[in-house]
Protein backbone atom coordinates (compact mmCIF):
# COMPACT_ATOMS: atom_id res chain seq x y z
CA UNK A 1 0.00 0.00 0.00
CA UNK A 2 1.25 3.47 -0.68
CA UNK A 3 1.72 6.72 1.34
CA UNK A 4 0.69 6.80 4.85
CA UNK A 5 -2.80 5.77 6.74
CA UNK A 6 -3.98 7.53 8.77
CA UNK A 7 -7.29 7.05 11.09
CA UNK A 8 -10.12 9.18 13.04
CA UNK A 9 -10.11 8.70 16.79
CA UNK A 10 -13.55 9.20 18.25
CA UNK A 11 -14.31 8.15 21.68
CA UNK A 12 -17.82 6.65 22.93
CA UNK A 13 -19.54 5.71 26.51
CA UNK A 14 -21.44 2.38 25.79
CA UNK A 15 -23.26 1.22 28.18
CA UNK A 16 -24.70 -2.62 27.84
CA UNK A 17 -26.87 -4.83 29.77
CA UNK A 18 -25.41 -8.85 30.80
CA UNK A 19 -27.57 -10.58 28.52
CA UNK A 20 -28.31 -14.55 29.20
CA UNK A 21 -24.63 -15.33 27.83
CA UNK A 22 -23.20 -12.18 29.15
CA UNK A 23 -21.90 -9.61 27.46
CA UNK A 24 -21.04 -11.16 24.25
CA UNK A 25 -17.10 -10.20 23.24
CA UNK A 26 -14.18 -11.28 22.74
CA UNK A 27 -10.76 -9.11 24.52
CA UNK A 28 -6.52 -8.83 23.54
CA UNK A 29 -4.32 -6.94 24.87
CA UNK A 30 -2.71 -6.49 28.30
CA UNK A 31 0.97 -6.39 29.47
CA UNK A 32 1.61 -9.76 29.07
CA UNK A 33 -0.23 -10.04 26.02
CA UNK A 34 0.82 -7.00 23.64
CA UNK A 35 -1.81 -7.35 20.67
CA UNK A 36 -0.47 -3.93 19.15
CA UNK A 37 3.47 -2.64 19.11
CA UNK A 38 4.06 -0.63 22.19
CA UNK A 39 0.40 -0.72 23.36
CA UNK A 40 -0.35 -2.89 26.17
CA UNK A 41 -4.58 -1.65 26.01
CA UNK A 42 -7.31 -3.50 25.79
CA UNK A 43 -8.97 -4.58 22.12
CA UNK A 44 -11.95 -6.10 21.05
CA UNK A 45 -11.29 -9.32 19.09
CA UNK A 46 -14.32 -10.82 18.65
CA UNK A 47 -18.21 -9.62 19.03
CA UNK A 48 -20.08 -12.93 19.53
CA UNK A 49 -23.71 -13.43 17.07
CA UNK A 50 -26.87 -11.98 19.07
CA UNK A 51 -24.93 -11.41 22.20
CA UNK A 52 -24.97 -8.55 24.15
CA UNK A 53 -22.78 -6.38 22.44
CA UNK A 54 -23.44 -7.16 18.79
CA UNK A 55 -27.27 -6.53 19.48
CA UNK A 56 -26.28 -3.31 20.86
CA UNK A 57 -24.34 -3.05 17.39
CA UNK A 58 -21.58 0.07 19.10
CA UNK A 59 -18.72 -2.03 19.87
CA UNK A 60 -16.90 -3.22 16.60
CA UNK A 61 -13.97 -5.53 16.46
CA UNK A 62 -10.85 -3.92 16.70
CA UNK A 63 -11.73 -1.17 19.55
CA UNK A 64 -9.64 -0.19 22.24
CA UNK A 65 -11.50 -0.72 25.26
CA UNK A 66 -10.18 2.47 27.81
CA UNK A 67 -12.27 1.71 31.16
CA UNK A 68 -14.86 -0.60 32.31
CA UNK A 69 -17.63 1.04 34.99
CA UNK A 70 -14.79 4.04 35.05
CA UNK A 71 -11.93 1.79 36.04
CA UNK A 72 -8.90 2.31 33.95
CA UNK A 73 -7.45 -0.38 31.60
CA UNK A 74 -4.16 0.63 31.39
CA UNK A 75 -1.35 -1.53 32.63
CA UNK A 76 -3.47 -4.10 33.29
CA UNK A 77 -2.53 -8.20 32.78
CA UNK A 78 -5.13 -9.90 30.28
CA UNK A 79 -6.18 -12.08 32.75
CA UNK A 80 -7.06 -9.52 34.98
CA UNK A 81 -8.92 -7.43 32.27
CA UNK A 82 -10.69 -10.59 31.51
CA UNK A 83 -11.76 -11.01 35.34
CA UNK A 84 -12.43 -7.01 35.49
CA UNK A 85 -15.27 -7.78 32.79
CA UNK A 86 -16.50 -10.98 34.56
CA UNK A 87 -17.19 -9.03 37.71
CA UNK A 88 -18.39 -6.28 36.37
CA UNK A 89 -22.20 -6.65 37.10
CA UNK A 90 -25.08 -6.71 35.04
CA UNK A 91 -25.28 -3.27 33.75
CA UNK A 92 -21.65 -2.52 32.42
CA UNK A 93 -20.17 1.13 31.12
CA UNK A 94 -17.65 0.87 28.66
CA UNK A 95 -15.49 3.81 27.69
CA UNK A 96 -14.45 2.95 23.96
CA UNK A 97 -12.22 4.35 21.02
CA UNK A 98 -13.12 3.52 18.20
CA UNK A 99 -10.29 3.94 15.06
CA UNK A 100 -11.70 4.21 11.46
CA UNK A 101 -9.33 4.70 8.80
CA UNK A 102 -9.29 7.53 6.83
CA UNK A 103 -7.02 7.35 3.86
CA UNK A 104 -5.69 4.74 1.34
CA UNK A 105 -8.68 2.66 1.06
CA UNK A 106 -12.21 2.15 2.25
CA UNK A 107 -13.34 3.24 5.66
CA UNK A 108 -13.33 0.61 8.10
CA UNK A 109 -12.75 -0.33 11.54
CA UNK A 110 -8.50 -1.53 12.75
CA UNK A 111 -8.30 -4.92 13.01
CA UNK A 112 -4.84 -4.75 14.51
CA UNK A 113 -1.30 -3.72 13.83
CA UNK A 114 0.03 -0.18 14.61
CA UNK A 115 -2.49 2.14 16.78
CA UNK A 116 -0.76 5.40 15.23
CA UNK A 117 -3.41 7.77 13.78
CA UNK A 118 -4.47 11.29 13.85
CA UNK A 119 -6.84 12.25 16.18
CA UNK A 120 -10.70 13.76 14.68
CA UNK A 121 -9.83 17.50 16.19
CA UNK A 122 -6.40 17.24 14.55
CA UNK A 123 -8.12 17.21 11.25
CA UNK A 124 -11.73 19.42 11.59
CA UNK A 125 -9.17 22.19 13.72
CA UNK A 126 -7.85 23.07 10.54
CA UNK A 127 -10.85 22.52 8.58
CA UNK A 128 -12.95 24.89 10.83
CA UNK A 129 -10.12 27.37 10.59
CA UNK A 130 -10.24 27.28 6.35
CA UNK A 131 -13.73 27.63 6.42
CA UNK A 132 -13.37 30.81 8.81
CA UNK A 133 -11.06 32.52 6.55
CA UNK A 134 -12.92 31.38 3.13
CA UNK A 135 -15.69 32.94 5.24
CA UNK A 136 -14.23 36.22 5.98
CA UNK A 137 -12.32 36.76 2.69
CA UNK A 138 -15.74 36.02 0.79
CA UNK A 139 -17.57 38.90 3.13
CA UNK A 140 -14.56 41.67 2.82
CA UNK A 141 -15.39 40.81 -1.39
CA UNK A 142 -18.83 41.50 -1.36
CA UNK A 143 -18.20 44.78 1.21
CA UNK A 144 -15.83 45.83 -2.00
CA UNK A 145 -18.77 45.11 -4.66
CA UNK B 1 -7.78 -14.78 8.03
CA UNK B 2 -6.83 -17.78 10.31
CA UNK B 3 -5.63 -20.91 8.84
CA UNK B 4 -5.18 -24.20 10.53
CA UNK B 5 -3.48 -27.27 9.00
CA UNK B 6 -3.60 -30.27 11.07
CA UNK B 7 -0.81 -33.30 10.60
CA UNK B 8 -0.14 -35.81 12.78
CA UNK B 9 -2.91 -38.55 12.22
CA UNK B 10 -2.02 -42.23 11.40
CA UNK B 11 -2.84 -45.96 11.92
CA UNK B 12 -1.93 -47.04 15.70
CA UNK B 13 -2.26 -50.27 17.45
CA UNK B 14 -4.09 -50.06 20.77
CA UNK B 15 -2.24 -48.79 23.73
CA UNK B 16 0.23 -46.76 21.37
CA UNK B 17 0.87 -42.92 21.17
CA UNK B 18 0.49 -40.60 18.35
CA UNK B 19 1.63 -36.55 18.53
CA UNK B 20 -1.05 -34.33 16.49
CA UNK B 21 -0.15 -30.33 15.62
CA UNK B 22 -2.06 -27.83 14.59
CA UNK B 23 0.15 -25.08 12.46
CA UNK B 24 -1.71 -21.46 12.44
CA UNK B 25 -1.37 -18.83 10.82
CA UNK B 26 -1.22 -15.26 12.08
CA UNK B 27 1.24 -12.89 13.60
CA UNK B 28 -1.28 -12.96 16.93
CA UNK B 29 -0.79 -16.76 17.39
CA UNK B 30 0.05 -15.55 21.44
CA UNK B 31 -3.38 -14.23 21.18
CA UNK B 32 -5.29 -17.06 20.04
CA UNK B 33 -7.16 -20.15 22.78
CA UNK B 34 -6.83 -22.68 21.12
CA UNK B 35 -8.87 -26.60 21.25
CA UNK B 36 -9.39 -30.11 19.66
CA UNK B 37 -12.18 -31.28 18.68
CA UNK B 38 -13.28 -35.07 17.11
CA UNK B 39 -15.68 -35.84 14.93
CA UNK B 40 -16.89 -39.27 13.70
CA UNK B 41 -19.34 -39.41 10.30
CA UNK B 42 -22.64 -38.51 11.06
CA UNK B 43 -22.18 -37.38 14.49
CA UNK B 44 -21.93 -34.45 16.45
CA UNK B 45 -18.28 -32.60 17.10
CA UNK B 46 -17.48 -33.62 20.39
CA UNK B 47 -14.70 -31.55 22.62
CA UNK B 48 -11.46 -33.52 23.62
CA UNK B 49 -8.90 -30.49 25.03
CA UNK B 50 -8.22 -26.53 24.63
CA UNK B 51 -5.99 -24.56 26.14
CA UNK B 52 -5.53 -20.83 26.91
CA UNK B 53 -3.27 -17.99 24.88
CA UNK B 54 -0.62 -18.48 26.91
CA UNK B 55 -0.61 -22.66 27.96
CA UNK B 56 -0.90 -22.11 31.46
CA UNK B 57 -4.79 -23.12 31.20
CA UNK B 58 -6.27 -26.28 29.84
CA UNK B 59 -9.28 -28.29 29.93
CA UNK B 60 -10.19 -32.31 28.87
CA UNK B 61 -13.12 -34.17 28.26
CA UNK B 62 -13.42 -36.87 30.31
CA UNK B 63 -13.23 -39.34 28.42
CA UNK B 64 -9.32 -38.02 27.34
CA UNK B 65 -7.99 -37.12 30.80
CA UNK B 66 -4.74 -38.56 32.01
CA UNK B 67 -4.21 -40.10 28.74
CA UNK B 68 -4.28 -37.06 26.44
CA UNK B 69 -1.88 -33.61 27.01
CA UNK B 70 -2.91 -30.35 24.56
CA UNK B 71 0.16 -28.18 24.51
CA UNK B 72 0.97 -24.90 22.67
CA UNK B 73 4.61 -22.93 20.88
CA UNK B 74 3.49 -19.45 20.87
CA UNK B 75 7.06 -19.19 18.91
CA UNK B 76 5.94 -22.25 16.07
CA UNK B 77 2.04 -21.04 16.14
CA UNK B 78 1.69 -24.64 16.75
CA UNK B 79 -0.39 -26.56 19.34
CA UNK B 80 -0.13 -29.93 19.64
CA UNK B 81 -2.36 -33.18 21.10
CA UNK B 82 0.07 -35.88 22.71
CA UNK B 83 -1.98 -38.68 22.47
CA UNK B 84 -1.37 -42.02 24.86
CA UNK B 85 -2.99 -45.20 25.21
CA UNK B 86 -5.04 -44.94 22.40
CA UNK B 87 -8.45 -46.87 22.25
CA UNK B 88 -10.17 -48.07 19.23
CA UNK B 89 -13.31 -45.65 20.29
CA UNK B 90 -10.29 -43.01 19.68
CA UNK B 91 -10.71 -43.64 15.96
CA UNK B 92 -12.36 -40.41 14.25
CA UNK B 93 -11.01 -37.44 12.25
CA UNK B 94 -9.69 -34.78 14.51
CA UNK B 95 -10.12 -31.19 14.03
CA UNK B 96 -8.04 -28.02 15.64
CA UNK B 97 -10.45 -25.01 16.40
CA UNK B 98 -9.27 -21.05 17.25
CA UNK B 99 -10.50 -18.27 18.55
CA UNK B 100 -8.59 -14.49 18.63
CA UNK B 101 -9.02 -13.63 22.20
CA UNK B 102 -10.32 -14.21 25.32
CA UNK B 103 -14.13 -14.00 26.52
CA UNK B 104 -15.46 -11.53 28.67
CA UNK B 105 -18.25 -14.62 29.83
CA UNK B 106 -17.87 -17.50 31.19
CA UNK B 107 -15.42 -19.89 29.53
CA UNK B 108 -16.78 -22.39 28.17
CA UNK B 109 -13.79 -24.46 25.97
CA UNK B 110 -16.07 -27.31 25.03
CA UNK B 111 -18.74 -25.33 23.17
CA UNK B 112 -17.94 -25.09 19.34
CA UNK B 113 -19.56 -21.96 19.50
CA UNK B 114 -16.61 -20.53 21.50
CA UNK B 115 -14.23 -21.08 18.41
CA UNK B 116 -14.10 -18.88 14.58
CA UNK B 117 -11.66 -21.00 13.05
CA UNK B 118 -11.74 -24.89 12.09
CA UNK B 119 -9.07 -26.70 10.36
CA UNK B 120 -10.15 -29.41 7.96
CA UNK B 121 -9.23 -32.15 10.77
CA UNK B 122 -6.58 -35.24 10.42
CA UNK B 123 -7.71 -38.84 10.72
CA UNK B 124 -6.50 -41.31 13.66
CA UNK B 125 -7.22 -44.58 13.39
CA UNK B 126 -6.67 -46.99 16.31
CA UNK B 127 -6.63 -50.81 15.27
Known amino acids: MNGRVDYLVTEEEINLTRGPSGLGFNIVGGTDQQYVSNDSGIYVSRIKENGAAALDGRLQEGDKILSVNGQDLKNLLHQDAVDLFRNAGYAVSLRVQHRLQVQNGPIGHRGEGDPSGIPIFMVLVPVFALTMVAAWAFMRYRQQL | DVQLVESGGGLVQAGGSLRLSCAASGRTFSTYEMAWFRQAPGKEREFVAA????????YYADSVKGRFTISRDNAKNTVYLQMNSLKPEDTVVYVCAAVIGSTVDEYRPSDPLEYDYWGQGTQVTVS
Open chain 2, 51 to 58: INWSGSST
